[in-house]
């Protein structure tokens, strides 16, 4: 029975050219995390495998950094980075848990005027 829940940073915004940390946290379960996949829509960005470490997609290697923890840091943000991101926790023995984050990358002038999403 899957008892765990995924907590995420929810809806977030960041400035173009800046960086952001995508963070998910699995709680309320004793399941062992075998691997976390980070995906943008249907594209695999990176994985963190408990036994084998981090692997970052070559397409994003220059702009994606592993961590902190099981999170993912996106750097040199562009407007095209706006969209949904998913953390997929493969656990034993529970199975798969998925968390969703929506990132909006704003032009720096807009961001300075506080047009930001509220994190729930």
């Amino acid at each position: 029975m899957m008892t765990g829940t995924i907590e995420t940073t929810g809806n977030i915004s960041a400035e173009k050219g800046g960086s952001i940390i995508l963070q998910c946290h699995l709680s309320s379960t004793t399941a062992q995390v075998t691997q976390v996949n980070w995906e943008q829509q249907d594209q695999l960005l990176a994985i963190c495998n408990a036994d084998l470490g981090w692997h970052i997609s070559p397409s994003f290697k220059d702009r994606v950094a592993p961590g902190p923890g099981l999170g993912l840091t996106l750097q040199s943000l562009t407007v095209n980075d706006t969209g949904e991101y998913f953390c997929i926790y493969h656990t034993y023995p529970d199975g798969t848990y998925t968390g969703r984050i929506f990132l909006e990358v704003l032009e720096s002038s807009v961001a300075e005027h506080g047009a930001r999403f509220q994190i729930p």
Epitope: Q35, L44, D51, H90, G95
Partner: antibody
Framework: EVQLLESGGGLVQPGGSLRLSCAAS????????MSWVRQAPGKGLEWVSA?????????YYADSVKGRFTISRDNSKNTLYLQMNSLRAEDTAVYYC?????????????WGQGTTVTVSS | QSVLTQPPSASGTPGQRVTISCSGV????????VSWYQQLPGTAPKLLIY???QRPSGVPDRFSGSKSGTSASLAISGLQSEDEADYYC???????????FGGGTKLTVL
């Protein structure tokens, strides 16, 4: 349809080399760990090697082949390779290419038909 | 010698239920999911069970898997002549940092 097709097997003398290939189709090749598994005549399955997703910068080997075999991948060609050097009689086997589950530790969900390697003088 | 231990052979008559065991240790079976593979004579292995007890599409529900502690088992009910094959269990071992298989069990349908 997900398919794996091995090639490159054959007869080779002890101490010789051989390069196996595995052409993949029907799935996003770069997003999966891939493995080689072998089966000696009349024997069971033996995992040989695996390679990480994406650029394949991490590789894993059974102790029996460490230092002699090299696994690699070319994502632009959807192809997995196994370079086998310093071959021994005990390397004689059918070699299978296998696609791993999204998580390597969860096993292999698709197998090729195999290619036969015979090491003999 | 294989890291996972399976009986070398098993047999049953058509319609019977047969169970094949697979024994390991904490660094493999206890900590990870177990898969089962079927190898019909002269063919490549095929995934039969993954995630301890999950069947891929196309695998009949006569095949079932289970796991408890450091052991796993494959049960085949309503045995049929076409089930005659070699069966292998497999899992990850985090001490070896390698995938490991059982030695295989040859199932004979009498």
């Amino acid at each position: 349809e997900v398919q794996l097709l091995e090639s490159g097997g054959g007869l080779v003398q002890p101490g010789g080399s051989l390069r196996l290939s595995c052409a993949a189709s029907g799935f996003t090749f770069s997003s999966y760990y891939m493995s080689w598994v072998r089966q000696a005549p009349g024997k069971g399955l033996e995992w040989v090697s695996a390679i990480s997703i994406f650029s394949g910068d991490s590789t894993y080997y059974a102790d029996s082949v460490k230092g002699r075999f090299t696994i690699s991948r070319d994502n632009s060609k959807n192809t997995l390779y196994l370079q086998m050097n310093s071959l021994r009689a005990e390397d004689t086997a059918v070699y299978y290419c296998a696609k791993s589950h999204t998580v390597l530790q969860y096993g292999m969900d698709v197998w090729g038909q195999g290619t036969t390697v015979t090491v003999s003088s | 010698q294989s890291v996972l231990t399976q009986p070398p052979s098993a047999s049953g008559t058509p319609g019977q239920r047969v169970t094949i065991s697979c024994s390991g240790v904490t660094s493999n079976i206890r900590n990870y999911y177990v898969s089962w593979y079927q190898q019909l004579p002269g063919t490549a292995p095929k995934l039969l069970i993954y995630g301890n007890d999950q069947r891929p599409s196309g695998v009949p529900d006569r095949f079932s898997g289970s796991k408890s502690g450091t052991s796993a088992s494959l049960a085949i009910s309503g045995l049929q002549s076409e089930d005659e094959a070699d069966y292998y269990c497999g899992t990850w071992d985090n001490t070896l940092n390698a995938w490991v298989f059982g030695g295989g069990t040859k199932l004979t349908v009498l």
